[in-house]
Amino acid sequence: SERCDDWGLDTMRQIQVFEDEPARIKCPLFEHFLKYNYSTAHSSGLTLIWYWTRQDRDLEEPINFRLPENRISKEKDVLWFRPTLLNDTGNYTCMLRNTTYCSKVAFPLEVVQKDSCFNSPMRLPVHRLYIEQGIHNITCPNVDGYFPSSVKPSVTWYKGCTEIVNFHNVQPKGMNLSFFIPLVSNNGNYTCVVTYLENGRLFHLTRTMTVKVVGSPKDAVPPHIYSPNDRVVYEKEPGEELVIPCKVYFSFIMDSHNEIWWTIDGKKPDDVPVDITIIESVSYSSTEDETRTQILSIKKVTPEDLKRNYVCHARNAEGEAEQAAKVKQKVIPPRYTVELACGFGAT
């Protein structure tokens, strides 16, 4: 056969669908790889061919479109499962071709099982709602094209395992779920189950998403440095280990580039002749505020090191902050017995 323009396995689209539910999968060629749509290709005499490779197999095989009740079918550039089975998992290929042209792309399809509380290995989209601010709506996602607009499906919303009925600030209305003044207690996984009738058969579509209530833009502030601060003095003897944490709070700001760093005598730690180790860590609050820590340590501090200026810096999209650490050399009290004895003329 003629050479085919092979786009390989498109791992960016790792499609996951629930077992025993309808699934409609568009050929990615027209969405991401080719500059024309299916209608144009079809009217130019190009044919779309589907085939697949089962999980843990190397053999490409045609898709069986002659299953009972048309369980798998193709409509224009869409591959339909009504419904899916667990063993439909595999790599699917759509190929567009005629006698002189060929282009194809493969993509992974994973059919996953869910339990009665909608728990599954499915990767969940995240919706962020601003805390205590206004009314937020989320819409049951990825249900377009499953049924005609004349069909009015029933929609049931759940938080975790519980159907949303009489929740104090969450209200379902068809495909939408409204949050009135979101609170941290609204964090969790929300599921819509859409039920519709097609050719006398009842189908369910299950869509789960994670809701995270995050800090509001009106609460966005420049970084706040917890440590070092004016109350703590790092008093060390030469030869001891000096450990100073730079611990900074960042309010949640969508996509903010949050950074912390140390300077020593106004220079990068690398530009100072000191053997320094810096270890960084990060933690998040329930509203995705961030606490970053950079621990600066010098194993065996010298008298010169104890005279240097150690400054912790931080910045986010709102502004900057800096704080110097109070470092000093410990004054060693006289060793009483020896020095007193010397004072009395003892040898």
Epitope: P269, I276, I278, I279, E280, V282, R315, A317
Partner: antibody, heavy 117, light 107 residues
């Protein structure tokens, strides 16, 4: 002397994979965030991915999310970029960059990745 | 994402003249803007950081100004080695973005 040396570039078929590496020397590698920046032939600069000094925080450009993975080995002073499902538009010179808080202050010479169709 | 628009796309000047390059952000990036210089066949080099601070080893003829959305790189008196492509870059929000570049060429 502070230096970054990229390797691993080359010619690859569309849909294929490549792993770029960057050897760092002359500075305390684990103290710095690192990034990859690319430049397609005759085009401008495009940020690809960044990783924090400890390696626990990563960010990606939308154009590579799900296909590329940035990682680092602080014990070997090495930065990596695993590139899967390569496309023609990934053809570029890939620069390994030291990313200090204010800017990308040290750049490697770059390694060329060519994705053929 | 924040879009950085540089102008002009090309600037034709003679050595000794003053060059003014502009970079405009689609939303405020505070003062977290850097400028880079790139010569043919070479990696870029950091010139200016935080809108107005010269990086180590950068000559005093390079200066930067601006904050928020409008930024300027000025080269007070052009030297032959200054003819190159200049990029601005914002570091306020992810993703990090670059401008499309201004080519500074000899008239």
């Amino acid at each position: 002397e502070v230096q970054l040396l990229e390797s691993g570039g080359g010619l690859v078929q569309r849909g294929g994979s490549l792993r770029l590496s960057c050897a760092a020397s002359g500075f305390t590698f684990s103290s710095y965030a690192m990034s990859w920046v690319r430049q397609a032939p005759g085009k401008g600069l495009e940020w690809v991915s960044s990783i924090s000094g400890s390696g626990d925080s990563t960010n990606y450009a939308d154009s590579v999310k799900g296909r590329f993975t940035i990682s680092r080995d602080n014990s070997k002073n090495t930065l990596h970029l695993q590139m899967n499902s390569l496309r023609a538009e990934d053809t570029a010179v890939y620069y390994c960059v030291r990313d200090y808080y204010y800017g990308m202050d040290v750049w490697g010479h770059g390694t060329t990745v060519t994705v053929s169709s | 994402e924040i879009v950085l628009t540089q102008s002009p796309a090309t600037l034709s000047l003679s050595p000794g003249e003053r060059a003014t390059l502009s970079c405009r952000a689609s939303q405020s990036v505070n003062s977290y803007l850097a400028w880079y210089q790139q010569k043919p066949g070479q990696a870029p080099r950091l010139l200016i950081y935080d809108a107005s601070n010269r990086a180590t080893g950068i000559p005093a003829r390079f200066s930067g100004s601006g904050s928020g959305t409008d930024f300027t790189l000025t080269i007070s008196s052009l030297e032959p080695e200054d003819f190159a492509v200049y990029y601005c870059q914002q570091r306020s929000y992810w993703p990090i973005t670059f401008g499309q570049g201004t080519r500074l060429e000899i008239k």
